[in-house]
């Protein structure tokens, strides 16, 4: 490439270029000037830049740096944003299916328990969804509430269907008996373990993806220091003052400037690496009871087994509960 | 035992679900995401170099700009002058990160700690001889990681059933489910394919 022509004797070309950034010709000298007031593009000889032009170039440098950062992170940002949205939607679908499977199980196997069972199942899976999205709900409480609500219905509809209406106010007693007598065996505890482990992992996975987006957004919109702005201006725009629009910065010089400007950003590197490796470790462990898809879509089966367990022990239970809750109107069993 | 939906009998007919070997599951999608993320593991350390390589710098040109003047690209002067008068470059590095960067580093530290805490402990052994408290011995113990339930024939094999792209969308109207005595999930005709989860490359 031929050497660039000597600087424009009239600053005409500099004006044309600067005009695109700042319409109006007021800031560009007609002919080269000493430029003694310049603070960034310190001239070795006459210059076509003014102090105002320097300021505009500094603003342009910062904007350009922001653009370069944003285009550098575009692919990464898109990857995480898309996946966060896709996984969130997929988890919601899993929850919806799990609810439908459970409702179908009740409808097919225990029609007498509907529609109350549908209501309790619906509330449980609503809480599951809210938990995944970060709500401050206790998983054990969710599971306990499901079984506490189900047992009175199971008792009055399946185990004691002939119970007179007058006896239907023993629900509180039955809820208490459910826990103390472990009427569902260890199934509630099992479900608590599985659901809490799988949901915790799912929740932290989504939180981690959303934080990933926040990290990139933060570095995308960093406001660079004045010193950095001056360094960038020197590298990218000071040549314009000499009428040298097409010259490029020396490669090593660019690296020095960028490392200086991004010293703070580069400090994220250690934690970013750790973030990706920790996320990988989490994902590698997301199987069996740590996989909410696996756990939630199998819940209907475990709930079914827990009801069968109650039915299997119905004789003993009915006798015990009959004694415990016989006078529940006077003395609520706790 | 209550079987996973794929194995259920509905109206004495087996619910058939087509198996497509390469279908994408949530877990395969998670692994794919991690692989892609790992290609960005050096993103922040590589950023200065990336920006220089993606903005005009002298490559084939004989002359380049060193901040003050045009110099020969390979001359010592180019390197030397590029380094000096760089507005307290050392001081710039000494200042430390901006408050927003410090904040985001703190958030990363916190999530990393959570992720490590959450990561599944290695080498969990499956204990098949766990007694259940209550009225009768059962299948699963207090903290049995792998037991998904299922009485009678031991542990139930749970398949990763929810396909990611060709998903079994059981958008069920429960009133349509037949009230037979076998445990069941929706009927064949209630299986629709879910399409609007885009495949991100």
């Amino acid at each position: 490439q031929p050497p660039p022509p000597p600087p424009d004797a009239t600053c005409h070309q500099v004006r044309s270029f600067f005009q695109r950034l700042q319409p109006g010709l007021k800031w560009v000298p007609e002919t080269p000037v000493p430029g003694s007031d310049l603070q960034v593009c310190l001239p070795k000889g006459p210059t076509c830049c003014s102090r105002k032009m320097e300021e505009k170039y500094q603003l342009t440098a910062r904007l350009n740096m922001e653009q370069l950062l944003q285009s550098a992170s575009m692919e990464l940002k898109f990857l995480i944003i898309q996946n966060a949205a896709v996984f969130q939607e997929a988890f919601e679908i899993v929850v919806r299916h799990a609810k439908n499977y459970t409702n179908a199980m009740f409808k097919n196997n225990y029609p007498s328990l509907t529609p109350q069972a549908f209501e309790f199942v619906g509330e449980f899976f609503t809480d599951v969804s809210l938990y995944i999205l970060g709500s401050d709900i206790n998983v054990d409480d969710m599971v306990n509430e499901l079984f506490d609500s189900l047992f009175p219905v199971i008792y009055t509809q399946l185990m004691n269907p002939g119970l007179p209406d007058s006896a239907l106010d023993i629900n509180e007693c039955l809820r208490g008996a459910r826990r103390d007598l472990k009427v569902f065996g260890n199934f509630p505890k099992l479900i608590m373990t599985q659901v809490s482990k799988s949901l915790q992992v799912t929740r932290i996975f989504l939180q981690a993806l959303n934080l990933g987006i926040e990290v990139i957004n933060t570095t995308d919109h960093l406001k660079f220091s004045k010193d950095c702005g001056r360094m960038l201006t020197r590298m990218w725009y000071c040549s314009y003052c000499q009428g040298l629009m097409m010259v490029k910065p020396c490669g090593g010089y660019c690296n020095v400037v960028m490392q200086g400007c991004m010293a703070g950003v580069v400090e994220i590197d250690k934690y970013w690496r750790e973030y990706i490796l920790s996320l990988e470790e989490l994902v590698n462990g997301m199987y069996r009871i740590y996989d909410m898809e696996n756990v939630l879509l199998g819940l209907f089966s475990t709930i079914h087994d827990s009801i069968q367990y109650v039915q299997k022990n119905a004789g003993k239970l009915t006798t015990t509960i009959g004694k415990l809750c016989a006078h529940s109107q006077q003395r609520q069993y706790r | 035992s209550a079987y996973y939906p794929e194995d259920l009998f509905i109206d004495k007919k087996v619910l058939k679900v087509a198996h497509v070997e390469h279908e994408e599951t949530l877990s395969s999608r998670r692994r794919e995401l991690i692989q892609k993320l790992k290609s960005f593991i050096s993103f922040y350390s590589a950023l200065p170099g990336y920006i220089c390589s993606h903005s005009p710098v002298a490559e084939n040109d004989t002359l380049c700009w060193n901040g003050q003047e045009l110099v020969e690209r390979y001359s010592q002067k180019a390197a030397r002058n590029g380094m000096k008068n760089q507005f307290n470059l050392h001081e710039l590095k000494m200042k430390g990160p901006e408050p927003v960067v410090s904040q985001i580093i703190d958030k990363l530290k916190h999530i990393n700690q959570l992720l490590r805490t959450m990561s599944v402990p290695k080498g969990r052994v499956l204990d098949k001889n766990l007694d259940e408290e209550g009225f009768e011995s059962g299948d699963c113990g207090d903290d049995e990681d792998e037991c998904i339930g299922g009485s009678g024939d031991g542990m139930m094999k749970v398949k990763n059933q929810l396909r990611f792209l060709a998903e079994l969308a059981y958008d069920l109207d429960v009133d349509d489910v037949p009230g037979n005595n076998q445990q069941a999930t929706p009927k064949d005709n209630e299986i629709s394919t879910f399409h609007n989860l885009g495949n991100v490359h």
């Epitope: 022509p5 270029f17 950034l21 342009t60 575009m74 | -």
Partner: antibody, heavy 118, light 105 residues
Framework: EVQLVQSGAEVKKPGSSVKVSCKAS????????ISWVRQAPGQGLEWMGG????????NYAQKFQGRVTITADKSTSTAYMELSSLRSEDTAVYYC????????????????WGKGTT | ETTLTQSPGTLSLSPGERATLSCRAS???????LAWYQQKPGQAPRLLIY???SRTTGVPDRFSGSGSGTDFTLTISRLEPEDSAVYYC??????????FGQGTK
């Protein structure tokens, strides 16, 4: 790959105004510079003006000063050219074109063009 | 005001021949800011050459540009039938900001 899609053909009465749009896809719109060039039937190319969306600053050729307004909407990646006080000699194909830039400064070469609006 | 004059107005040649198109500026133009465009009927212009002599991506190497100061040339070494078009030169950086030549057909 950057593409510029222009709005459809317009028929206007003398004295009225016309607003032509140019939607960009691919790349980072805010860091482009967009120029508008027109071509009367059987004639050559004539630069009307240009804008750098990130600055919102527009420049106009002397001939069109006061009659043309070039704007850009970063949120929709769309540039607009409005020409007022239309006369019969304004009958032409109006092109939008992306200008090559170095560090946000347009270098004057138009490397991507819309298909034109008549 | 800088004007660009292109010659000849029309050039009739056969495939395989060499075409030489001229562009003359009324004032000296920096070679960094002179471009050549090709326009086929019913199509938008296409950038061929920038900075007087640099080819853009995808432009065949039979197209070459040269010149400095006030005289610039576009050469098509071996003409192909698809090279039939109008060619415009354009300068940037002098008032008015952008100027096109009238074109060579």
């Amino acid at each position: 790959e950057v593409q510029l899609v222009q709005s459809g053909a317009e028929v206007k009465k003398p004295g009225s105004s016309v607003k032509v749009s140019c939607k960009a896809s691919g790349g980072t719109f805010s860091s482009y510079a967009i120029s508008w060039v027109r071509q009367a039937p059987g004639q050559g190319l004539e630069w009307m003006g240009g804008i750098i969306p990130i600055f919102g600053t527009a420049n106009y050729a002397q001939k069109f000063q006061g009659r043309v307004t070039i704007t850009a909407d970063k949120s929709t990646s769309t540039a607009y050219m409005e020409l007022s006080s239309l006369r019969s000699e304004d009958t032409a194909v109006y092109y939008c074109a992306r200008e090559w830039q170095q560090q946000l400064v347009p270098l004057g070469y138009m490397d991507v063009w819309g298909k034109g609006t008549t | 005001e800088t004007t660009l004059t292109q010659s000849p107005g029309t050039l009739s040649l056969s495939p395989g021949e060499r075409a030489t198109l001229s562009c003359r500026a009324s004032h000296s133009v920096s070679s960094n800011f002179l471009a050549w465009y090709q326009q086929k009927p019913g199509q938008a212009p296409r950038l061929l050459i920038y900075a007087a002599s640099s080819r853009t991506t995808g432009v065949p190497d039979r197209f070459s540009g040269s010149g400095s100061g006030t005289d610039f040339t576009l050469t098509i070494s071996r003409l192909e039938p698809e090279d039939s078009a109008v060619y415009y030169c354009q300068q940037y950086g002098y008032s008015p900001l952008y100027t096109f030549g009238q074109g060579t057909k």
